[in-house]
Interface confidence: medium
């Protein structure tokens, strides 16, 4: 069973290497457990960046991942990826799985192209 | 690190709902542990159908999945998906990860379009 997942097409990371974007899904369905996975697509390769499971009680996610954070509210997840460098520029896809109770639904967004520009190194200040 | 994964573009499931296709990767690389994941892509959704890890000793995979089976030989996996119905028609991607020893390599095929036609129900024979 499929759900529709929407995410912005382009996001610019801050100079500190932080990119934030929402990931929304519909229909919201009556779900007690939602699994959100962020994947990075490069050519034909898909790499898992981070994943977490949200519940009604557990609305702050990615506690196991130092470079991802997220909050969950109804059918919207606000994602933040930090520690990004220019080499991390790429397409980041949000995958949403409505895990429980049945039926299982899954959807994947079209991806958010995150552009990261490395800051110029600061001159030594004596 | 990326590897190239090849799989046929189209396969027709049998009338019993069984589809078989090879998934090959190159370069083969000296690998003790290969993880193969079959994903189904529908529109922008990617669903994991089944996954298994092959080793030199464990060349028969997907024992945990009633609808997938596969055998592994060198750099080729012969995949079989059964229990398919017309609603399961879609693009099935083979993802290969060379897990161990380092370096980690990953690749994803372009997908095999599996067409499934439900058989006409047989008339009751008394």
């Amino acid at each position: 069973e499929a759900i529709q997942v929407t995410q912005p097409s382009v996001v610019l990371a801050s100079s500190h290497g932080v990119a934030s974007f929402p990931c929304e899904y519909s229909p919201s369905h009556n779900t007690d457990e939602v699994r959100v996975t962020v994947l990075r697509q490069t050519n034909d390769q898909m790499t898992e960046v981070c994943a977490t499971t949200f519940t009604e009680k557990n609305t702050v996610g990615f506690l196991d991942y130092p470079f991802c954070s997220g909050t969950f509210n109804e059918s919207r997840v606000n994602l933040t990826i930090q520690g990004l460098r220019a080499v991390d520029t790429g397409l980041y896809l949000c995958k949403v799985e409505l895990m429980y109770p049945p039926p299982y639904f899954v959807g994947m967004g079209n991806g958010t192209q995150i552009y990261v520009i490395d800051p110029e190194p600061c001159p030594d200040s004596d | 690190e990326a590897i190239q994964v090849t799989q046929p573009s189209v396969v027709l499931a049998s009338s019993h709902g069984v589809a078989s296709f090879p998934c090959e990767y190159s370069p083969s690389h000296n690998t003790d542990e290969v993880r193969v994941t079959v994903l189904r892509q529908t529109n922008d959704q990617m669903t994991e159908v089944c996954a298994t890890t092959f080793t030199e000793k464990n060349t028969v995979g997907f024992l945990d999945y009633p609808f997938c089976s596969g055998t592994f030989n060198e750099s080729r996996v012969n995949l079989t998906i059964q229990g398919l119905r017309a609603v399961d028609t879609g693009l099935y991607l083979c993802k290969v990860e060379l897990m161990y020893p380092p370096p980690y390599f990953v690749g994803m095929g372009n997908g095999t379009q599996i067409y499934v036609i439900d058989p006409e129900p047989c008339p009751d024979s008394d």
Partner: antibody, heavy 120, light 112 residues
Framework: EVQLLESGGGLVQPGGSLRLSCAAS????????MNWVRQAPGKGLEWVSA????????YYADSVKGRFTISRDNSKNTLYLQMNSLRAEDTAVYYC?????????????WGQGTLVTVSS | QSVLTQPPSASGTPGQRVTISCTGS?????????VHWYQQLPGTAPKLLIY???QRPSGVPDRFSGSKSGTSASLAISGLRSEDEADYYC???????????FGGGTKLTVLG
Amino acid sequence: EVQLLESGGGLVQPGGSLRLSCAASGFTFSSYSMNWVRQAPGKGLEWVSAISGSGGSTYYADSVKGRFTISRDNSKNTLYLQMNSLRAEDTAVYYCARDRVEMNQWLADWGQGTLVTVSS
Amino acid sequence: QSVLTQPPSASGTPGQRVTISCTGSSSNIGAGYDVHWYQQLPGTAPKLLIYRNNQRPSGVPDRFSGSKSGTSASLAISGLRSEDEADYYCAAWDDSLNGWVFGGGTKLTVLG
């Protein structure tokens, strides 16, 4: 190979408590929701409770709500059922069963069961 | 009283075809949830026989088949054998009860 092994059954008096365990092996335990299903002597199957893979969501049949608590320890690959305020009608063989989720859920694998007898 | 309704018993002679029905409601089978069938041989745990309405796990003979229509489902066993003598249960998820529901079970007897 998937294996589910229940333990903790036995004879208990009405109003008493019992804790059942189900040791799982042969699969990634935390990826699967788990269930308890019971069968009274000579009767049919009755679903008792379910818990999602992370343990964040729990579900109970009306007949046990408020008395039974399902939990899991993913680090130990073990499922539990804490049964309090037991009644004679809770007498049954208790099975743990594993959900499948890839194309839809179903109870794919069952343990051999553990017998709980509530009697004075 | 089970949420899914099955006949309490069924019987047939070796080689015959028998069908076991399972009737539900709009909150389970009628809501689109798949029906699964379990076989329980005497003194053993239930074993998955049919999943997703009509799919057989590996190792289950093709003599067993399942179908679903509307709010009901059925299990057919052709070429009946003595080892098929067992209890058969249907199951589905029920979204109003937020749990699995079972049929009351059908005891299949192979005569002769």
